[in-house]
Interface confidence: low
């Protein structure tokens, strides 16, 4: 092992006189530390400030050999390490480990020698531990980060952390002495101990490192601090909000509308040691698509990559932009997609017979599940009802029929929006399509739709204006097709009907004769049925017109 030069080489000399203390120069070796690293290995390491080129370091170790204690004559050994700032040696190298040894470093640069402070050390019990070498498990709760790792020995070490953020320098924190927790935290490591550390979580990404120091039973340090562990990189506690734009096209012929996402997900600033290293960054951005319509279906949601083009039905959806980090998923943007408004309403194929009401629509491919959703359009708008329909056998007429008792739900006299959705895979919210969507007036539409408060006003010599309050059916888009105004002379000599568009509630009747008693009635018609006539209103030109 011994020779004249090269890393790790050593030489032994008698100590005559060596200068004490430091050279006083700001350049040169400093922070010398010597310690035990394993059963047989010892190490000295130091820092060096100054030009690196052509520098050569020598570690000096001076001691009184155990068999020379009576003379007190010190013997010195030196190790030349070249440009390296670490020297490792064994007991076989002749350095006593059970008695005091004085160490210092001389750094030679050309004809100049710089010297470190001298340290005195009993090496045997001064052990440098390792930092956590394996996986450091990180969890987050209540604005705190917790780190756990396994150690196979040296339970009871003192532990420190240091952390920095993209805009801050390192700050040091104390994890406190570790008590023996009995077993490892990371699963399948028999006989290992665990250590842990708490530090604050922040709204910026953090780089954290751990170091450990052996602690004697007295509480005093039993060695120098270990090196710092590999960086642990953690994302901010609260991630920045995304600003994604969602662009929706109208429903196409297939009953689906295309949704495009535009914009960048926010980029996280990370500390220097976390660049290119996992942990602090968002692993991926996702969109959670949740279909809010058809609640009778177990709530359907699906996660897709951000930016994926989606084809959705005309139903109501919630879209949450998620950021996936080492701690799980966080919502960084929410967007609500309302149900598509109906621009055109088509008549539903609804028939009433006895106390049953039936509805029919064109069947899609075999194996399709349908969802029929109805929603009161005015008073109880959030009382949405739905039913899932899975046709058991194919109808030869390629129609799906759904029947219900005319008593409850859909038979109160009010307007409902009815939508039928279809899917071959009902658990996937992105595979539904709108089959049809329209409005339906429940109950007896003929009776409920009868116009009220019909009034007649004289206009000119042979004409009158008839006005009425809008039919209840007019609140239900597309249900009311027309009003019919009927006027007849009581002597039976004349009668006529006027057709009025559903948006109007007034008509002028002309060509009437004086001194004749007339009666006028109004009805509201749907596409399916003519309405019931209103109560007759009588008038003539001789009498006061009311």
């Amino acid at each position: 092992q011994l020779g004249a030069s090269g890393p790790g080489d050593g030489c032994c000399v008698e100590k005559t006189s060596f200068p004490e203390g430091a050279s006083g120069s700001p350049l040169g070796p400093r922070n010398l530390s010597c310690y035990r690293v394993s059963k047989t290995d010892y190490e000295c390491s130091w820092q060096y400030d100054g030009p690196e080129d052509n520098v050569s370091h020598v570690l000096w170790c001076c001691f009184v050999p155990p068999n020379h204690t009576h003379t007190g004559q010190e013997r010195c050994r030196y190790f030349s390490s070249g440009p390296d700032r670490t020297v490792q040696f064994w007991e076989q190298d002749g350095i006593p480990v059970l008695s005091k040894v004085n160490f210092w470093v001389e750094s030679r640069l050309g004809n100049r020698t710089m010297k470190s402070q001298k340290i005195s050390q009993y090496l045997y019990n001064w052990t440098k531990t390792t930092p956590p070498l394996g996986h450091i498990k990180v969890s987050q709760s209540h604005r705190q980060l917790r780190m756990d790792w396994n150690v196979s020995e040296e339970a009871g070490a003192e532990v420190q952390f240091r952390r920095r953020m993209p805009t801050t320098n390192w700050t040091l924190g104390d994890c406190g002495p570790q008590v023996n927790s009995g077993s490892g935290v990371l699963g399948d490591i028999r006989g290992s101990m665990s250590e842990s550390c708490l530090c604050p979580s922040e709204n910026m990404a953090q780089e954290i490192q751990i170091r450990r120091r052996r602690r004697l039973s007295s509480g005093a340090p039993g060695g120098p601090w270990s090196d710092w562990s590999m960086p642990v990189c953690v994302p901010p506690e609260v991630l920045p909000q995304a600003k994604i734009k969602f662009l929706v096209e109208p429903l196409n012929q297939g009953g689906r509308r295309r949704l495009t996402m535009q914009g960048q997900s926010p980029q996280l600033a990370v500390p220097e040691g976390c660049r290119g290293r996992p942990g602090a960054q968002v692993k991926k951005h996702l969109v959670l698509v949740r279909m809010l319509s058809c609640r009778c279906q177990a709530q359907t949601s699906k996660t897709v990559p951000l930016g994926k083009k989606l084809n959705l039905s005309g139903a109501t959806y919630d879209l949450n932009v998620l950021a996936k980090t080492r701690f799980g998923r966080s919502t960084i943007q929410k967007w609500h997609l309302p149900a598509q408004e109906l621009t055109e309403t088509r008549a539903l194929n609804v028939s009433v017979g006895g106390n049953m009401t039936s509805m029919q629509w064109a069947a899609q491919a075999p194996g399709t599940t349908y969802c029929l959703e109805w929603q009161p359009w005015f008073q109880h708008r959030n009382h949405t009802h739905c039913t899932l329909i899975v046709p058991e056998e194919e109808d030869p007429a390629k129609m799906v029929t759904h029947s219900w008792s005319s008593k409850p739900t859909l038979e109160q006299e009010e307007c409902y929006r009815i939508t039928v959705f279809a899917s071959k895979n009902p658990k996937n919210p992105m595979l539904w399509a709108t089959v049809l969507s329209s409005y339906y007036f429940g109950g007896n539409a003929s009776r409920a739709g009868t116009p009220r408060h019909v009034s007649v006003r004289n206009q000119t010599g042979d004409s009158v204006s008839v006005e009425w309050t809008a039919s209840q059916l007019s609140t239900c888009p597309g249900v009311l097709t027309q009003y019919v105004v009927r006027c007849e002379a009581e002597d039976g000599a004349w009668e006529s009907e006027w057709l009025v568009p559903p948006t109007k509630t007034q008509v002028t009747l002309d060509g009437l004769r004086s001194r004749v008693m007339y009666k006028v009635q109004v009805r509201a018609d749907t596409a399916r049925l003519p309405g019931a006539w209103s109560h007759p209103q009588r008038f003539s030109f001789e009498v006061q017109i009311s």
Epitope: V37, T130, L133, H135, I189, M230
Partner: nanobody
Amino acid sequence: QVQLQESGGGSVQAGGSLRLSCAASRYTYTNNFMAWFRQAPGKEREGVAAIYTGDGYAYYFYSVKGRFTISQDNDENMLYLQMNSLKPEDTAMYYCAAMERRIGTRRMTENAEYKYWGQGTQVTVSS
């Protein structure tokens, strides 16, 4: 049975380079220590470098620090030792070794900790 197979040894002039490879089969590769040891004729087996496969943490024995680099390829279950600035005293049989324990501490430097050993590959450095 776990098998470790070294390759890449050979003869080289002082100052030259070699790259040793070790293929690990039927070995739980992740979260373990693997190491390179060497044994020169008439001498004891000594450590060269060790690595924690969980995160790539490397440890070098003082005689090779700054000249040798240990690395891994987790996907291929391979361990490598890049040896630069070779010296005649680096001449030895080089062995790949793997620990059975799932985690370790500084005892990664002791050959008694390693259960699985390869057959070795010879490196000869002439001046």
